[in-house]
C-alpha cells in the first residue's frame, strides 16, 4: 500500500508508518510498527528532553560551574534544563549564562543609575551639577552637594562632580 505522506501532530513518519513521538522527559527506544506502539524510556538522572521527540539520547543538564562564577538558579527536571545564574556581585556574559563577570563599578564623578542583577551589568550615569560621587562603587548613587545655607554656613569651596562643597562659617562684619 502507498505510505501516508503526512502524519498528525505528535507523530512522525518512519518506514511508511506514522508513529507517536515520545513525550517530553522520555527518549525513543524503538519505532512503532503497524501493530506495536512506539517504545519510549524516561531520561536518566541529570538528563532531559523538553519537546515531543524521537531522540535516542536525552540531553545532559547544563553544569553551573562555580569556577566560572556560576550557581544553580533552577534545578533541571526530566523535561527542563538546569538554569544557571551568577554568584552575588557577578553577572552573566550572555543570555545563555555560560560564564560570569564581576559587576562594573561606577568611577568617581559617576553614580549608579541601575544596580546590576545576575543577568545585567551596572548602569552608571555622570553626576549632574549639584551632585557628586567621590568613590568607585557598584551601589552608590550620586549624592547631592551639602546645602551650606541650611546649616547657616557659607560655601568656602565649590563642589564638583567628584567632590562635595566645603562649607565654612560666615564672616562676621566688624563694627
Amino acid at each position: 500500500p502507498e505510505p501516508p505522506t503526512a502524519c498528525r501532530e505528535k507523530q512522525y513518519l518512519i518506514n511508511s508508518q506514522c508513529c507517536s513521538l515520545c513525550q517530553p522527559g522520555q527518549k525513543l527506544v524503538s519505532d512503532c510498527t503497524e501493530f506495536t506502539e512506539t517504545e519510549c524510556l524516561p531520561c536518566g538522572e541529570s538528563e532531559f528532553l523538553d519537546t515531543w521527540n524521537r531522540e535516542t539520547h536525552c540531553h545532559q543538564h547544563k553544569y553551573c560551574d562555580p569556577n566560572l562564577g556560576l550557581r544553580v538558579q533552577q534545578k533541571g527536571t526530566s523535561e527542563t534544563d538546569t538554569i544557571c545564574t551568577c554568584e552575588e556581585g557577578w553577572h552573566c556574559t550572555s543570555e545563555a549564562c555560560e560564564s560570569c563577570v564581576l559587576h562594573r563599578s561606577c568611577s568617581p564623578g559617576f553614580g549608579v543609575k541601575q544596580i546590576a542583577t545576575g543577568v545585567s551589568d551596572t548602569i552608571c550615569e555622570p553626576c549632574p551639577v549639584g551632585f557628586f560621587s567621590n568613590v568607585s562603587s557598584a551601589f552608590e548613587k550620586c549624592h547631592p552637594w551639602t546645602s551650606c545655607e541650611t546649616k547657616d554656613l557659607v560655601v568656602q569651596q565649590a563642589g564638583t562632580n567628584k567632590t562635595d562643597v566645603v562649607c565654612g562659617p560666615q564672616d562676621r562684619l566688624r563694627a
Partner: nanobody, 124 residues
Framework: QVQLVESGGGLVQPGGSLRLSCSAS????????MAWFRQAPGKERDFVAA????????YYADSVKGRFTISRDNSKNTLYLQMSSLRAEDTAVYYC?????????????????WGQGTQVTVSS
C-alpha cells in the same frame, strides 16, 4: 481524510450469520489500518478485530476468534466483517475505525476516524 459508513446490520437468530461492510470515501484507503469495534447497551466500546493496510495481518478479540473474519478490498475502499455462529452477547452497535499511527490493535484512542455504527441484534 477518510469518511466511514457502515452497513449490513440487522436482526439475526442465534447461530446465524451476517456480513457487515464499511465503505470509505476519500483518498488513500490503503494507507489506513482498519478495525471493527462494538458497543453493547450500557457497556464500553470494545475491540473486535483489526486488519493491516495490505490485508495480510489480522487480529481478533478472544470472544470472536474462529467465528468472525475481518477482510478488506482496497480496490473498492471497503472493509468487511463476516460474522457467523452469532450469539445473543454479540448484540451491539458495530463501528468501523481507521488509523494511520502504529499502535496495538485494540487501542481505541489511536483510531482517528470512526463511522456512525450499524446495529446488530441477535435474538430468537
Amino acid at each position: 481524510q477518510v469518511q466511514l459508513v457502515e452497513s449490513g446490520g440487522g436482526l439475526v437468530q442465534p447461530g446465524g450469520s451476517l456480513r457487515l461492510s464499511c465503505s470509505a470515501s476519500g483518498r488513500a484507503f490503503n494507507t489506513y489500518t482498519m478495525a471493527w469495534f462494538r458497543q453493547a447497551p450500557g457497556k464500553e466500546r470494545d475491540f473486535v478485530a483489526a486488519i493491516s493496510r495490505d490485508g495480510t495481518i489480522t487480529y481478533y478479540a478472544d470472544s470472536v476468534k474462529g467465528r468472525f473474519t475481518i477482510s478488506r478490498d482496497n480496490s473498492k475502499n471497503t472493509l468487511y466483517l463476516q460474522m457467523s455462529s452469532l450469539r445473543a452477547e454479540d448484540t451491539a452497535v458495530y463501528y468501523c475505525a481507521a488509523r494511520r499511527v502504529g499502535a496495538v490493535p485494540e487501542r481505541e484512542s489511536a483510531y482517528e476516524h470512526w463511522g456512525q455504527g450499524t446495529q446488530v441484534t441477535v435474538s430468537s
